[in-house]
């Protein structure tokens, strides 16, 4: 659950009167531009671990769309346009907060979830296992 | 607000009926497991565009915790181990959901947010501006 | 229909050059990396080079000193430059096309029926 | 460069009979990003070589459920559960984790 505030107006998220259910206003506060993030920077492109980005679409979900990176290559790319597989691409991950609609199809209700998303790729040092 | 997928029991989400304000059950669904992202790998040292992780904690907000990366170069690091200045380390941002407590220490209400956080970073050729 | 067909090969004399093509039909190159693997008469697969969806590229260090891939999209056919060659060049060359770059597989899906390169004097 | 080997390099296996081969790898063949890219391919008499398994253990479309690939790491194995006359030929193991892509020697499934 949600840790709250310790102060005397807020039950302990222990507390069996600690609610499961809260109220959430769907008002969107925006605390920066919402950019469709293909349009907001063509790092994806001009990265030496370059990613292309798929859509996931799930109108069970809000947000219903969600962009997962996935890395093009194996290897990184060098400043020739050749593929160097003595590196890595790999993806970061990051996990983020979603609502799924519970029950299903219903407007008013939500369960809150965590899912794990790809955001980018980076190009990573890798870790040799030789046999023996 | 959230798009209703269109079917007899949901309202339009344009339609004045449609409810600003939903329930959330707050035992949150995990699709995958919860890691610490300082823990989940070590990308973060690994990559040629190494990043620092920076704890944001906020008490009044769900998730309460978000780390934060910051590239620790301007430029990417070489095999070698060196600096190189003619590629720059850049974050790659990610668009998150948030819940923002609404009344202030209230615990059952809260607001929908949307804030941009650095996931990792990752090595880009830059864009050179020459003086004409 | 996917289909790859290699053209190009032929004798060529020690020192020589040769330029191998493979045309593809049914999909893209701009959608599918394509291999170059070779196989000298009687040995296994051996991995040349690869020019991916993206247009990057990656070879086998031995050989990269002396063979180019390329490809032209607009003609929807993937190139091999061989110069230099030796007689342990005699091979069938294969191109072979990778999975869709939405699959991220690496794996080699469908093989032309190869063109046959003999360097000898 | 990553050395794929074989084994065995012959197999005579009777039709309805079933067969294994392993291929070991000189280094592991888990990619940075925790997959494992090793494939098998067979090349027909006559032929040019044809997809059977990606990725371990996932069979390419078109290709029997008699196939099945398996192994982590290093070890790797393809099983044929009952032999038929058509899968005669030359199996090839493969690694594309690491550049320069590399094949196994083969082996060889011939008919009893």
């Known amino acids: 659950g949600i840790a709250i505030p310790r102060n005397s107006g807020c039950p302990n998220s222990e507390d069996k009167n600690f609610p499961r259910t809260v109220m959430v206003n769907l008002n969107i506060h925006n605390r920066n531009t919402s950019t469709n993030p293909k349009r907001s920077s063509d790092y994806y492109n001009r990265s030496t671990s370059p990613w292309n980005l798929h859509r996931n679409e799930d109108p069970e979900r809000y947000p219903s769309v969600i962009w997962e990176a996935k890395c093009r290559h194996l290897g990184c790319v060098k400043a020739d346009g050749n593929v160097d597989y003595h590196m890595n691409s790999v993806p970061i991950q990051q996990e983020i907060l979603v609502l799924r609609r519970e029950p299903r199809h219903c407007p008013n209700s939500f369960r809150l979830e965590k899912i794990l998303v790809s955001v980018g790729c980076t190009c990573v040092t890798p870790i040799v296992h030789h046999v023996a | 607000g959230i798009a209703i997928p269109r079917n007899s029991g949901c309202p339009n989400s344009e339609d004045k009926n449609f409810p600003r304000t939903v329930m959330v059950n707050l035992n949150i669904h995990n699709r995958n497991t919860s890691t610490n992202p300082k823990r989940s790998s070590d990308y973060y040292n690994r990559s040629t565009s190494p990043w620092n992780l920076h704890r944001n904690e906020d008490p009044e907000r769900y998730p309460s915790v978000i780390w934060e990366a910051k590239c620790r170069h301007l430029g990417c690091v070489k095999a070698d181990g060196n600096v190189d200045y003619h590629m720059n380390s850049v974050p790659i941002q990610q668009e998150i959901l948030v819940l923002r407590r609404e009344p202030r220490h209230c615990p059952n209400s809260f607001r929908l947010e949307k804030i941009l956080v650095s996931v990792g970073c990752t090595c880009v050729t830059p864009i050179v501006h020459h003086v004409a | 229909e996917v289909q790859l067909v290699e053209s190009g090969g032929g004798l060529v004399q020690p020192g020589g050059s040769l330029r191998l093509s493979c045309a593809a039909s049914?999909?893209?190159?701009?959608?599918?990396?394509v291999h170059w693997v070779r196989q000298a008469p009687g040995k296994g697969l051996e991995w040349v080079s690869v020019?991916?969806?993206?247009?990057?590229?990656t070879y086998n260090s031995a050989l990269k000193s002396r063979f180019t891939i390329s490809r032209d999209n607009s003609k929807n056919t993937l190139y091999l430059q061989m110069n230099s060659l030796r007689a342990e060049d005699t091979a069938v060359y294969y191109c072979?096309?990778?999975?869709?770059?939405?699959?991220?597989?690496?794996?080699?899906?469908?093989w032309g029926q190869g063109t046959t390169v003999t360097v000898s004097s | 460069d990553i050395v794929m080997t074989q084994s065995p390099l012959s197999l005579p296996v009777t039709p309805g009979e079933p067969a294994s081969i392993s291929c070991r790898s000189s280094?592991?063949?888990?990619?940075?990003?925790?997959?494992?890219?090793f494939h098998w391919y067979l090349q027909k008499p006559g032929q040019s070589p044809q997809l059977l398994i990606y990725?371990?253990?996932n069979r390419f479309s078109g290709v029997p459920d008699r196939f099945s690939g398996s192994g982590s790491g290093t070890d790797f194995t393809l099983k044929i559960s009952r032999v038929e006359a058509e899968d005669v030929g030359v199996y090839y193991c493969?690694?594309?984790?690491?550049?320069?892509?590399?094949f196994g020697q083969g082996t060889k499934l011939e008919i009893k």
């Open positions: 072979a096309r990778d999975t869709h770059y939405r699959l991220y597989y690496y794996a080699m899906d469908y």
């Open positions: 280094q592991s063949l888990v990619h940075s990003n925790g997959d494992t890219y």
């Open positions: 990725k371990v253990s």
């Open positions: 049914g999909f893209s190159l701009d959608s599918y990396g």
């Open positions: 020019i991916w969806s993206d247009g990057t590229t």
């Open positions: 493969s690694q594309t984790t690491h550049a320069p892509f590399t």
